[in-house]
């Protein structure tokens, strides 16, 4: 660092002396009361060929000194007056000091009725004093003088001293406000320091500091520390900053110049929208988080979230951060689409790129329906099994079951239902179901029962009599049977074109009709089977009933 200035002291300690008197100058360095090594003396800029730390002078002018451990002292102006009356001030004098003024006559014994003046006005209570004290002097351009009466033989002659401008030294330097940055970035810390320097000749003086923005006091007001740490600066902290330093006794107060501090707002850049779950693939009912972030940007950032096709924003957040989140609870199918976010901390928002959100919907319970050519399915019919979930994101895989046996599967790539075709056989009767699966969990349909009805085959009519030949009085059994056909089957029995009667068979084995034979029962017999899918006629069987002996009766 720079070596401290040397200090020039006077002995006697008055800056004005009479011509012919001697004044001792002492060069003192702050590090040592007296200088060590060579001391350089200058009188009106001229190097004097004396190297002691103490010199005697008789010539007026500006004196300076410099020691090995210090830099050049401030100039001290010493006056040697040829006048009869001089006003002396103690040297050194600092701002705020109570300074002693002494009115001296060349022949002081014959000088009386001394009066002291400041700027032409008599100082109060200053009449006929050898010395007076002027309280708390400042560095103004006040001029002091004194008057006195000089005895000249028997006369008293009034004499006036030359005006004295007291060399008041600064007790401490005018403060300078230093900021760690004059254009801090919003959100960054800043240190303000109220810099001053106390005169090394007055190390015991205690100073206090206060810092201001515009007219507002910062921190806790007066403090013994010249430093104030502001943890984070915001745009509203921009303004005119200054500081004050004063002695703790309030005798001297000094104010720094104002420093304009503009808090710089870093415009937002690189706005990014991120969606959780990552990738923007959601299942209906899940929660979605839209995270809007900026790579750079300071201060208060307004984030907003937008969806394509929606005029109003989904939400807005204003906060001092580089990231904000918007929570969308239990997403619905309608939440699918393209999203972007915007961030703004200056004048116009910066937009992120679009991000697509897909909301996948689990399949609902599918509904199984039969599509057939007729209400009652018949063997040979083409049956279409149609399975459909009314909700669910494609692709949906449908599986078809008959009595828990997988018949097959069919995919619906773009939604809707799927069909499976069967050419019906009698075995296809039973319970059918389907399930739907789009990867978000399979759902089962209710079971649907199918009855495949079989048309009756051509019945066979057989006549059963006790003997080989039908004889009057025999009990004849007409038996009609279709070997195929869904029950119930209604069997009709005919003699010639007369209906003998009908019998319903609810299970296999056909149906029988009994006749007690008479001769009139001879003739052609037939039967018919009908289960509602079309009647089938048997072949005609001829019966010959004989009225004589049993062994002559025959069947053809």
């Amino acid at each position: 660092g720079v070596a401290p200035k040397a200090v020039l002291l006077l002995n006697p300690p008055w800056s004005t002396a009479f011509k012919g008197e001697k004044v001792a100058l002492i060069c003192s360095s702050i590090s040592h009361s007296l200088a060590q090594g060579d001391t350089y003396w200058y009188h009106d800029e001229k190097l004097l060929k004396i190297k002691h730390d103490k010199i005697q002078i008789t010539e007026p002018g500006n004196y300076q000194c410099k020691t090995r451990g210090s830099s050049l002292s401030d100039a001290v102006h010493v006056e040697f007056s040829p006048d009869w009356l001089i006003l002396q001030a103690l040297h050194p004098v600092f701002e705020g000091d109570n300074v002693i003024l002494r009115c001296q006559g060349k022949d002081n014994k014959n000088t009386h009725q001394k009066v002291y003046y400041k700027d032409g006005k008599q100082l109060p209570n200053s009449y006929n004093l050898e010395k007076i004290t002027v309280n708390s002097v400042s560095r103004d351009n006040s001029k002091y003088h004194c008057t006195a009466y000089r005895k000249f033989y028997i006369l008293d002659i009034e004499v006036t001293s030359k005006p004295l401008n007291i060399q008041v030294q600064e007790l401490f330097l005018h403060p300078v406000l230093r900021a760690s940055s004059s254009t801090p970035i919003e959100g960054s810390p800043m240190t303000l320091t109220c810099e001053t320097q106390l005169s090394p000749q007055r190390p015991d003086v205690q100073l206090q500091f206060s810092l201001f923005r515009d007219s507002q006091t910062l921190g806790l007001g007066w403090s013994r520390s010249p430093r104030l740490q502001i943890p984070a600066m915001w745009t509203e902290d921009s303004g005119s900053y200054w500081c004050e330093v004063e002695t703790v006794t309030h005798s001297i107060k000094k104010r720094s110049l104002r420093s304009q501090i503009r808090v710089q707002r870093v415009p937002v850049s690189n706005v990014n929208l991120e969606i959780r779950p990552t990738g923007g693939q959601l299942i209906e009912g899940e929660n979605m988080v839209l995270i809007c972030s900026v790579a750079q940007g300071s201060g208060t950032v307004t984030f907003s979230w937008h969806k394509e096709g929606r005029v109003r924003s989904l939400g807005r957040k204003t906060q001092r951060s580089l990231l904000a989140e918007l929570h969308v609870l239990t997403v619905k199918e309608s939440d699918a689409g393209r999203y972007y976010c915007a961030a703004d901390n200056v004048h116009s928002p910066i937009l992120s790129t679009w991000i697509r959100v897909t909301v996948r919907i689990p399949v609902s319970h599918p509904v199984l329906t039969f599509r057939a050519p007729r209400a009652h399915t018949v063997v040979g019919d083409l049956l279409e099994l149609h399975c459909e979930s009314l909700r669910g994101s494609p692709p949906i895989l449908y599986r078809f079951y008959h009595e828990d046996v997988t018949l097959g599967n069919s995919s619906a790539p773009s939604g809707g239902g799927a069909s499976f075709n069967l050419s019906l056989t009698a075995e296809h009767s039973g319970n059918y179901s389907c399930d739907a699966d789009n990867g978000l969990g399979a759902q089962h349909s209710h079971g649907v029962s199918l009855r495949v009805t079989v048309p009756v085959s051509r019945p066979v009519l057989t006549l059963r009599a006790p003997g080989a030949q039908a004889v009057v009085g025999d009990l004849l059994e007409l038996h009609c049977e279709s070997l195929r056909g869904s029950f119930p089957i209604l069997y009709w029995f005919y003699h010639e074109d007369d209906t003998l009667g009908n019998i319903s068979a609810h299970s296999g084995g056909g149906a029988s009709f009994n006749l007690s034979l008479t001769t009139e029962h001879s003739g052609n017999y037939s039967c018919e089977a009908d289960n509602g899918l079309g009647a089938q006629h048997s072949k005609v069987v001829t019966l010959n009933v004989t009225g004589t002996s049993r062994n002559r009766t025959g069947l053809t």
């Epitope: 720079v2 200035k5 200058y42 800029e45 001229k46 190097l47 500006n62 300076q64 830099s71 050049l72 401030d74 100039a75 102006h77 030294q169 600064e170 330097l173 005018h174 300078v176 810099e195």
Partner: antibody, heavy 116, light 108 residues
Amino acid sequence: EVQLQQSGPELVKSGASVKMSCKASGYTFTDYYMKWVKQSHGKSLEWIGDINPYNGETFYNQKLKGKATLTVDKSSNTVFMQLNSLTSEDSAVYYCARGLYFFAYWGQGTTLTVSS
Amino acid sequence: DIQMTQSPATLSVTPGDSVSLSCRASQSISNNLHWYQQKSHESPRLLIKFASQSISGIPSRFSGSGSGTDFTLSINSVETEDFGMYFCQQSNNWPQYTFGGGTKLELK
């Protein structure tokens, strides 16, 4: 009468060095500091450095980072300033001046032109 | 570093006018402030030392005042020979001296 006589104008190439002089008369040479000042065309004044002819002690403007070197020849009451690694920025009038705190007497100036 | 700021940059006056030139230091420099005059194609000339001390050979119409950070050079009744550039210089942090940017005093 105090007089400071400076050497004549210099035209030098970029990258070269130059040494100019200032001869003092009319006072005791070793009693007063000598200063050097630069004045670019139409601009203000910039202090370069001080030399104490009594003991050769030098002080330089910290901003100029070794651009100048000041020397003294007591036998001829002359101070010298050498400027090195010259660029067009060094084209200016250079004054020597006597004084400790202020610049009481000035030389007539030396014009330096640096050509590329 | 101590910066010295002079104002105004240019001052247009008529002979006979009285003018004040300002010099402001970036920090307190006590009375360690000196004023110079430089006429066209001439070397500068010392006018005032230590803010207010006069220099022998300089006309009494030139006077200086101020202390700390604000200083003034006053010319009482400008004469035609006074036109030119005026510079202030601080010597507070010896030996690092700095000059102000200058004020041009010109004929109106």
